[in-house]
Interface confidence: low
């Protein structure tokens, strides 16, 4: 999906609003340094698809983000803001059903959170930062 | 209304330093970033580097490394570049801009510099 | 870096032509691309960013398209104050890179 279309400050509203402190929610009780960002974005579509991969697309060790709160308010976000995104998501949405919800927080869970955390807020003031 | 104004014309001698200021207005000066832009006379574009109001962090272009010092006063939405060890080929204008993803939707009117001997 | 090269250099046109003024990157940059207009003693003037969203309150003459390395910018009808300098520039990370530009004259 090409985001280039995205209101941006809309979706920006939203995760002010609402995603942010979901992502804080799910993250509670782990220190802000425990993990390094390795993924980065450089201007907010770039960050949009990377945002959009590491809450939808399960990984190894990690695969049921797309059912928790922030995600379910990220999709919503892109759905509104995004023209035509609804509809690239509706074979994606199909298989996501079929998953079972997840029982425990793991680790790399936790780790991927962060990476989205990271992203989040470089989606708010767009630009490489290289380390 | 956005509006970057910049500095007055400058004449330098080589080897000396000069800095152009950029006074921004009608945003707010810490949400955007600010990058400056060479253009010799009778050339093309030259992208130098950008500095963020919000952190001042820096990031430059590798050939304005150690030629180009970017630095802001938040205090009076003012952003300066002072380029320094002058020579014939610093002659240019040089315009900032400000951005939010790459690429510059207001420009200051160009400053231009002129080094001669 | 990434390198834009801009083609033509320079054309001559007569009002009321379509114009098409190309632009070709070194490497992916998706739609990472905007377009400026410049005159002399001038500063520059964006036209088209994201490669095709057109910038506040240029006419709709003036269109972009493309994605990838390859990339157009048109203006449908020219018209005597478009008669200017245009140059690309890739915004897909740093360093930001220009084209050379492109001089559009009249005929």
């Known amino acids: 999906y090409d985001f280039t279309n995205c209101d941006f400050e809309k979706i920006k509203a939203a995760y002010l609003s609402t995603i942010s402190k979901d992502l804080i929610t799910y993250m509670s009780g782990t220190k802000s340094t425990e993990f390094n960002n390795t993924v980065s974005c450089s201007n907010r579509p770039h960050c949009l698809t990377e945002i959009q991969s590491l809450t939808f697309n399960p990984t190894a060790g990690c695969a049921s983000l797309a059912k928790e709160m922030f995600a379910m308010k990220t999709k919503a976000a892109l759905a509104i803001w995004c023209p035509g995104y609804s509809e690239t998501q509706i074979n994606a949405t199909q298989a996501m059903k079929k998953r079972r919800k997840r029982k425990v927080t793991t680790n790399k869970c936790l780790e991927q959170v962060s990476q989205l955390q990271g992203l989040w807020r470089r989606f708010n003031r767009p630009l490489l930062k290289q380390q | 209304q956005v509006q970057l104004v910049q500095s007055g014309a400058e004449v330098k001698k080589p080897g000396a330093s000069v800095k152009v200021s950029c006074k921004a207005s009608?945003?707010?000066?810490?949400?955007?970033?600010m990058h400056w832009v060479k253009q010799a006379p009778g050339q093309g574009l030259e992208w130098i580097g950008v500095?963020?109001?919000?952190?001042?962090?820096?990031t430059y272009n590798q050939k304005f490394k150690g030629k180009a010092t970017l630095t802001v006063d938040t205090s009076t939405s003012t952003a300066y570049m002072e380029l320094s060890s002058l020579r014939s080929e610093d002659t240019a204008v040089y315009y900032c801009?400000?951005?939010?993803?790459?690429?510059?939707?207001?420009w200051g009117q160009g400053t231009l510099v002129t080094v001669s001997s | 870096d990434i390198q834009m090269t801009q083609s033509p250099s320079s054309l001559s046109a007569s009002v009321g032509d379509r114009v098409t003024i190309t632009c070709r990157a070194s490497?992916?940059?998706?739609?990472?691309l905007a377009w400026y207009q410049q005159k002399p003693g001038k500063s520059p003037k964006l036209l088209v960013y994201?490669?095709?969203r057109p910038a506040a309150g240029v006419p709709s003459r003036f269109s972009g398209s493309g994605s990838g390395t390859d990339f157009t910018l048109t203006i449908s009808s020219l018209q005597p104050e478009d008669f200017a300098t245009y140059y690309c520039?890739?915004?897909?990370?740093?360093?930001?890179?220009f084209g050379q530009g492109t001089k559009v004259e009249i005929k």
């Open positions: 801009t400000r951005s939010l993803d790459g690429f510059f939707d207001y």
């Open positions: 520039q890739h915004h897909y990370d740093t360093p930001w890179t």
């Open positions: 994201f490669a095709r």
């Open positions: 009608g945003y707010t000066f810490t949400s955007y970033w």
């Open positions: 500095i963020d109001p919000s952190d001042t962090y820096t």
């Open positions: 490497e992916n940059i998706y739609s990472y």
